[in-house]
């Protein structure tokens, strides 16, 4: 996360940490928590070759990485059809936990926005992770949670800014129907925050609005921050995820 | 020390069934997930199906699903299998193993018991 | 599902060389495991993920290779170490085992 600060630790508990096996288990993207055994995640992440099992755990809503770690195991990763690359789209993927997560004011879930919802400029959105704090730039120790206010853009204003210096043609769209644009030179997501989630203040509901993508570099001029549009995959979420009652 | 006893094999005919258990000791079963695997005579290992350690996610080999529940009882420190329209090349040694807390693999096994089914 | 295919099935070789089981797995996988098993015996853990050794296997033992090919290596075989191999992966389920490979004396 470049700018904002540490998230209080009473905020953002639906947020996860994806580890994968090494001499550590070791963060390398965010999540959210979208049902007790669900996790909502970016594509990119866990794809397109997708990690065993094996090699793959979720630690639930911690204050810094690392220090009092629970990790869950997975029993099913599902990596939407249409993914290839982020900058292509569908970058978005599921995690299904073996167990139940017991819910609590500090972990439980996020809600999913209906598919009417827009979120346009001007909503209060977070965006939350234990990335990078600027390009090629580690969150130092002890690895905090953090958050930063990000303004949402127009798909259309962020495309054509994403055009500025670009080899791309006018005429070919890079930011899709299925992203979400948000950020600026001062705040933005960043590298290990991928997979994490965009959520926006709706009527007093925290919703989430996106899921961390992709962006060139983070906080660059003209280069907000490209995020997964939750509302385009609503269908395909509750194809696995059982709704609310 | 660790260790699972399997019990509940037999001969049966076909179209039986047969409920199998596996009772573990010298560790928390409740916090392991749990697996059973089979032999059949002179043949290979094949796996037949896992259990996570609170019951809730279940997965089966495509021969055995509809035929076969896994089920545990925590309290009982149990893992069990049922076993219903036995057939003929169901005939095998059953193997309750642990999985790995960490890695991952099947770190300790029973003896083994011998179901047959045969007319 | 994925499939894993070992070779050879079988194979004969004598005190003090060096012998090599392979696994293929049918589409890529992060980890190989690796079982040992003797006649009227349990199996026993033998390699996991990949290349670490279960415990009380001795060091002339190793296991390598990623993506699809796996193997397991004996540098110098030892009579103990005549048995059935299986190889197995935990990418998804279902899980599967390969068939076997059943190291013999010549």
């Known amino acids: 996360i470049v700018g904002g600060q540490e998230a209080p630790r009473s905020k953002w508990p639906w947020q996860v940490s994806l580890r994968v096996h090494g001499p550590y288990w070791m963060h390398f993207c965010g999540g959210s928590l979208i049902h007790p055994q669900w996790v909502l995640t970016a594509a990119h992440c866990v794809g397109p070759d997708v990690k065993d099992l094996a090699a793959l755990r979720v630690q639930l809503r911690e204050q810094h990485l690392y220090y009092q770690d629970q990790l869950l195991p997975v029993s099913r990763i599902i990596v939407h059809p249409q993914f290839y690359t982020a900058q292509i789209g569908a970058d978005i993927a599921l995690l299904e936990l073996e167990e139940p997560v017991n819910v609590s004011s500090h972990v439980h879930t996020v809600t999913l926005p209906p598919a009417s919802e827009t979120f346009p400029p001007g909503m209060p959105c977070w965006v939350t992770g234990w990335g990078d704090v600027d390009n090629d730039e580690r969150l130092p120790p002890p690895f905090p949670l953090k958050q930063v206010k990000v303004p949402i853009m127009e798909n259309h204003i962020c495309d054509a800014k994403y055009h500025l210096g670009a080899y791309t043609g006018d005429d070919v769209r890079i930011v899709r129907d299925d992203m979400l644009c948000a950020g600026n030179t001062r705040r933005d997501s960043c590298q290990g925050d991928s997979g994490g989630p965009l959520v926006c203040k709706v009527n007093g509901t925290w919703l989430q609005a996106g899921v961390v993508s992709w962006g060139e570099g983070c906080a660059q001029p003209n280069r907000p921050g490209i995020y997964t549009r939750v509302t385009y995959y609503l269908d395909w979420i509750h194809h696995y995820v059982p709704k609310k009652p | 020390e660790v260790q699972l006893v399997e019990s509940g094999g037999g001969l049966v005919q076909p179209g039986g069934s047969l409920r199998l258990s596996c009772a573990a000791s010298?560790?928390?079963?409740?916090?392991?997930?749990m697996v059973w695997v089979r032999q059949a005579p002179g043949k290979g290992l094949e796996w037949v199906a896992f259990?996570?350690?609170?019951?809730?996610?279940?997965y089966y080999a495509d021969t055995m699903k509809g035929r076969f529940t896994i089920s545990r009882d925590n309290s009982k420190n149990t893992l069990y299998l049922q076993m219903n329209s036995l057939r003929a090349e169901d005939t095998a040694v059953y193997y309750c193993?642990?999985?790995?807390?960490?890695?991952?693999?099947?770190?300790?096994w029973g003896q083994g018991t011998l179901v047959t089914v045969s007319s | 599902d994925i499939q894993m295919t070992q070779s050879p099935s079988s194979l004969s070789a004598s005190v003090g060389d060096r012998v090599t089981i392979t696994c293929s797995a049918s589409?890529?996988?992060?980890?190989m495991y690796w079982y040992q098993q003797k006649p009227g015996k349990s199996p026993k853990p033998w390699i996991y993920?990949?290349?670490d050794l279960a415990s009380g296997v001795p060091s002339r033992f190793s296991g390598s290779g990623s993506g699809t090919d796996f193997t397991l290596t004996i540098s110098s075989l030892q009579p103990e170490d005549f048995a059935t191999y299986y190889c197995?992966?935990?990418?998804?389920?279902?899980?599967?085992f390969g068939q076997g490979t059943k190291v013999e004396i010549k």
């Open positions: 193993t642990r999985r790995n807390y960490d890695d991952y693999y099947f770190d300790v």
């Open positions: 993920r990949t290349s």
């Open positions: 197995q992966h935990y990418h998804s389920y279902p899980l599967t």
């Open positions: 010298g560790f928390t079963f409740s916090d392991y997930g």
């Open positions: 259990i996570s350690s609170g019951s809730s996610t279940v």
């Open positions: 589409s890529s996988v992060t980890y």
